[in-house]
């Protein structure tokens, strides 16, 4: 009985996730058969997080609203592990908007998700953040510096990353 | 004051070049990311190149890319359109615009008095 | 491409009337409560003239009778009360995503 209405709150809890991710790719979370984690597939995974790299070309505010019509935001960076998990999955040769922007530019950055901006806590290029009119924040390779965060001009196309939380059935 | 004048306009055979040029005056040239944009006769405004203030991006739309180049002398505070391939479709009066961004995007506070181009046999 | 469509494409106005011009975008241009949609006049054999910038912000030295507002995809310029000096074709801009483009154009004449 008990494993029975187990069951029946994990359907309704994947009914729900249903719209937008049609398939979950889900792992036991340590020894209890009862705790499993999921990311959409093939979203990839880290830590409490799922990744999507979005190959498609948009603005920053595009990407963002792509972002959260999956259940998304574009990515907040909290630590250098997690910055070394995501760019396993970057092309060098692209750009990637971050969820990091400065809409009045005035250089105070602030995340999607309302997470305060660190400044200990930044990958910045050396040099960068070196222009008011470029707004939002991308990731990507420089050959002196591998991989590294600039600012950019927010109406101008380029891929991204999106991030949610892990869905636990 | 801000002052753009455009110059380099005339005509020009298909398949030909041009080279338009934007003196500016009146304001820190360097601080602001430029333009062009274009008007051909009887149409809507089409937005035809762009170039950010510290030079490092260039930007175009499919209808002009691998033909038309923009470029930027802070030194002489001017601004330039390096047109090639010329098609009659480019016939139209080049505004040379100022870019002033705001939150996500931007608009054009000042433009030129325009400088023609026209494509014919 | 974000298509920019105006209407009407031409409009009459006697002098103190209300003028007023929409323009529909084929998707929003609007984020977290910033309208990137700008409005322009121009003149015949003049360039653009900036006259209102994000949706309903009048640019310094135009005449309080241009007023603009709106949201998401539908976005209205007002001239009230228009004046003769207000003939001019007026377009509509969006700069949310490249490229920037440009509504087709109003032209307002006074009766």
């Known amino acids: 009985n008990f494993m029975y209405s187990k069951t029946v709150k994990r359907l309704s809890k994947l009914r729900e996730y249903q719209q937008y991710h049609p398939s979950l790719t889900c792992v036991m979370e340590g020894k209890d058969i009862e705790d499993w984690s999921c990311c959409p597939t093939p979203w990839t995974s880290f830590q409490s997080s799922c990744y999507f790299i979005s190959t498609g070309m948009q603005s920053w505010t595009k990407s963002q609203k792509n972002c959260s019509v999956m259940g998304a935001d574009l990515v907040v960076i909290n630590t250098r592990e997690e910055q070394d998990f995501i760019i396993q999955n970057l092309k060098r040769n692209s750009s990637y908007f971050l969820g990091l922007s400065d809409p009045g530019g005035r250089r105070h950055w602030q995340w999607v998700d309302q997470t305060p901006y660190n400044e200990n806590v930044t990958f910045w290029h050396s040099g960068e953040p070196n222009n008011l009119d470029e707004r939002c924040a991308i990731i990507n390779f420089r050959s002196s510096e591998e991989w590294g965060w600039n600012d950019i001009h927010c109406h101008v196309p380029q891929k991204s990353i999106c991030k949610m939380k892990k869905i636990y059935i | 004051e801000v002052q753009l004048v455009e110059s380099g306009g005339g005509l020009v055979k298909p398949g030909g070049s041009l080279r338009l040029s934007c003196a500016a005056s009146?304001?820190?040239?360097?601080?602001?990311?430029m333009s062009w944009v274009r008007q051909a006769p009887g149409k809507r405004l089409e937005w035809v190149a762009t170039?950010?203030?510290?030079?490092?991006?260039?930007y175009y739309p499919d209808s002009v890319k691998g033909r038309f180049t923009i470029s930027r002398d802070n030194a002489k505070n001017s601004l330039y359109l390096q047109m090639n391939s010329l098609r009659a479709e480019d016939t139209a009066v080049y505004y040379c615009?100022?870019?002033?961004?705001?939150?996500?995007?931007?608009?054009?506070?000042?433009w030129g008095q325009g400088t023609t181009v026209t494509v014919s046999s | 491409d974000i298509v920019l469509t105006q209407s009407p494409a031409s409009l009459a106005v006697s002098p103190g009337q209300r003028a007023t011009i929409t323009c529909r975008a084929s998707e929003s241009v609007s984020f977290h409560g910033t309208h990137l949609m700008h409005w322009y006049q121009q003149k015949p054999g003049q360039p653009p003239k900036l006259l209102i910038y994000a949706a309903s912000n009048l640019e310094s030295g135009v005449p309080a009778r241009f007023s603009g507002s709106g949201s998401g995809t539908d976005f209205t310029l007002t001239i009230n009360p228009v004046e003769a000096e207000d003939t001019a074709n007026y377009y509509c801009q969006q700069s949310i995503e490249d490229p920037p483009t440009f509504g087709g154009g109003t032209k307002v004449e006074i009766k």
């Open positions: 170039i950010s203030s510290g030079d490092s991006y260039t």
């Open positions: 615009a100022r870019q002033l961004y705001y939150s996500y995007g931007y608009y054009f506070d000042y």
């Open positions: 009146g304001f820190t040239f360097s601080s602001y990311g």
